[in-house]
């Protein structure tokens, strides 16, 4: 960076090298060049010479003033016009940054994705800070009072093997950067309550020729959790509103869900599950498209990504569910 150059003087920023976006700032340049009394001192921002708001302070120092500085990052350097020198002499350079102090982290969420071996904690960091912001995730056992801290710049994966202090914990997040520090509210968790089942995947769909044609969606999960509640949402691709079916599911076999759909229309399906009665849902599965036929022939669609563990499983039963209409987005 610009800060690694050999300096013949000194450049500094007031109030600081990292400052709040929108502030007025002063950049000072002081030459210290052998046998050079600078006739002029010049400032450059990102390689472009500044022409205004430069004040000579004394024989070796000049100040550049910026009002309402809004750039997240800039490389500044200054030069001297030395008599008897044919070109400007570099004095020094500095990278400057503007941004915001962190917001209070909120919506702290910790989940354990089945088979992952990790507890994943996320949070809403708030508005963009533009500057390097670090987060310390505090995990305190409510049984042993032991506290562990994890440093990260976004989310954190904590090995469940390291959670030796029982099942109940307090989790909170501290956000800090050069401009400030904030701390979230404490989240109380029980490890058994935050498990999210292994992802549910739609494998294929078929429309059966019958008096009233029906579409069967085949879907499955590798979860070992016994009591699982799922939702499948679907809509015509031209629609805004989702329809949602709810299921109480036992994944000892591939699930089949029946739908009575309009002919010759492209539909999109997604599924998600949670451990029954718990708080957190899986994210919605990837989009599965199926176009219903114009008339009677049987049509089969397959998922874009057809995992091998879905192959060769026999259909053991058909699940049915309750139909609701859903305008909700993804719920975590």
């Amino acid at each position: 960076g610009i800060t690694n150059i050999n300096c013949s003087g000194h450049i500094w920023v007031e109030p600081a090298t990292i400052f709040k976006m929108g502030m007025n700032i002063s950049i000072y340049c002081q030459a210290a060049i052998k046998n050079c009394q600078p006739r002029k001192l010049h400032f450059y921002k990102n390689g472009i010479k500044e022409r205004f708001q430069i004040t000579r302070i004394n024989k070796t120092t000049a100040r550049l003033w910026y009002k309402n500085f809004l750039e997240p990052h800039a490389s500044m350097y200054c030069t001297a016009e030395c008599p008897k020198h044919f070109q400007e002499t570099l004095i020094c350079g500095k990278d400057i940054s503007s941004g915001y102090p962190p917001d209070i982290p909120d919506e702290v969420t910790c989940v354990i994705y089945e088979y992952s071996g990790n507890m994943t904690c996320t949070w809403n960091a708030g508005k963009l800070t533009y500057i390097d912001t670090k987060y310390v995730v505090h995990v305190k056992s409510l049984e042993t009072e032991e506290e562990q801290q994890y440093l990260t710049s976004s989310y954190i994966n904590i090995s469940t093997d390291s959670l030796q202090g029982g099942k109940k914990y307090l989790v909170w997040v501290q956000a800090a950067n050069a401009l400030g520090m904030e701390e979230s509210k404490q989240l109380q968790i029980h490890l058994d309550d935050i498990v999210i089942p292994s992802a549910a995947v739609i494998s294929r769909a078929e429309t059966i020729n019958a008096t009233v044609p029906k579409t069967i969606i085949y879907w499955d999960s590798q979860t070992t959790i016994e009591k699982v509640s799922c939702e499948m949402r679907y809509k015509a691709t031209t629609n805004q509103t989702w329809n949602v079916k709810e299921f109480d599911t036992n994944f000892t076999y591939v699930q089949q869900s029946e739908f009575y759909l309009e002919p010759n229309i492209k539909y999109v399906f997604q599924v998600r599950c949670q451990e029954t009665g718990k708080r957190y849902w899986q994210p919605w599965s990837s989009l599965f498209f199926h176009k219903t036929p114009e008339t009677v022939p049987q049509v089969t669609s397959k998922a874009f990504q057809h995992d091998t563990w879905n192959s060769g499983l026999t259909v053991a039963s058909i699940s049915t569910g309750h139909l609701t209409s859903d305008n909700r987005g993804d719920i975590g």
């Epitope: 210290a32 060049i33 600078p38 000579r56």
Partner: antibody, heavy 116, light 107 residues
């Protein structure tokens, strides 16, 4: 172009002090390093002191230390040379000059006569 | 302090002559050496800086050479206006020091 205009001849008694002025034009005093050089009658040039831009300070020749000060008035772009406790051997022409590494602009010189 | 020794002290020459003045420093100067011309009752005038660079407006018959401790001012083809006293000066370290001067007079 730098132009340096100095004050006129001064006559002083031994033990007195003298203040020679050097008015700068073409540039501001903040853009120039002013040095002072003297020349006794029939003798060579002798550097007395001046501003060192590398270290940002005024440096004096050892033999004048304690007797010389080099104040500046940036509001009028005038540099001064104060020499106290004058002796007869201080009789000389005193030049202000700008150090643009080396001395490239010179005042016309100010004659100081020290005589009882 | 760095001592600057010029030779000769006086030099008699005629118009058109090639004149050489030498200056020796008591320690190496990294080429921070200047040459001045001074006429009676006038301020010195810069001729050469950084040992060999010609000051703007100075006639090309003046040239400087040398490095380290030994330096030379040469006037190739002396003109009537060149009869004056010449000084070398080091500006490598403080205090700045001058040679004692070389007077170039008419033979």
């Amino acid at each position: 172009q730098v132009h340096l205009v100095q004050s006129g001849t001064e006559v002083r008694k031994p033990g007195a002090s003298v203040k020679v002025s050097c008015k700068v034009s073409g540039y501001t005093l903040n853009e120039l390093a002013i040095h002072w050089v003297r020349q006794a009658p029939g003798k060579g040039l002798e550097w007395m002191g001046g501003f060192d831009p590398e270290h940002g300070e005024i440096i004096y020749a050892q033999r004048f230390q304690g007797r010389i000060t080099l104040p500046e008035d940036t509001s009028t772009d005038t540099a001064y040379m104060d020499l106290v406790n004058l002796r007869s051997e201080d009789t000389a022409v005193y030049f202000c000059t700008t150090e643009a590494a080396p001395f490239d602009y010179w005042g016309q010189g100010s004659l100081v006569i020290v005589s009882s | 302090d760095i001592q600057m020794t010029q030779s000769p002290s006086t030099l008699s020459a005629s118009v058109g002559d090639r004149v050489t003045i030498t200056c020796r420093a008591s320690q190496s100067l990294s080429n921070w050496l200047a040459w001045y011309q001074q006429k009676p009752g006038k301020a010195p005038k810069l001729l050469i800086y950084k040992a060999s660079s010609l000051e703007s407006g100075v006639p090309s018959r003046f040239s400087g050479s040398g490095s380290g401790t030994d330096f030379t001012l040469t006037i190739s083809g002396l003109q009537p206006d060149d009869f004056a006293t010449y000084y070398c000066q080091q500006y490598d370290i403080y205090p700045r020091t001058f040679g004692q001067g070389t007077k170039v007079e008419i033979k």
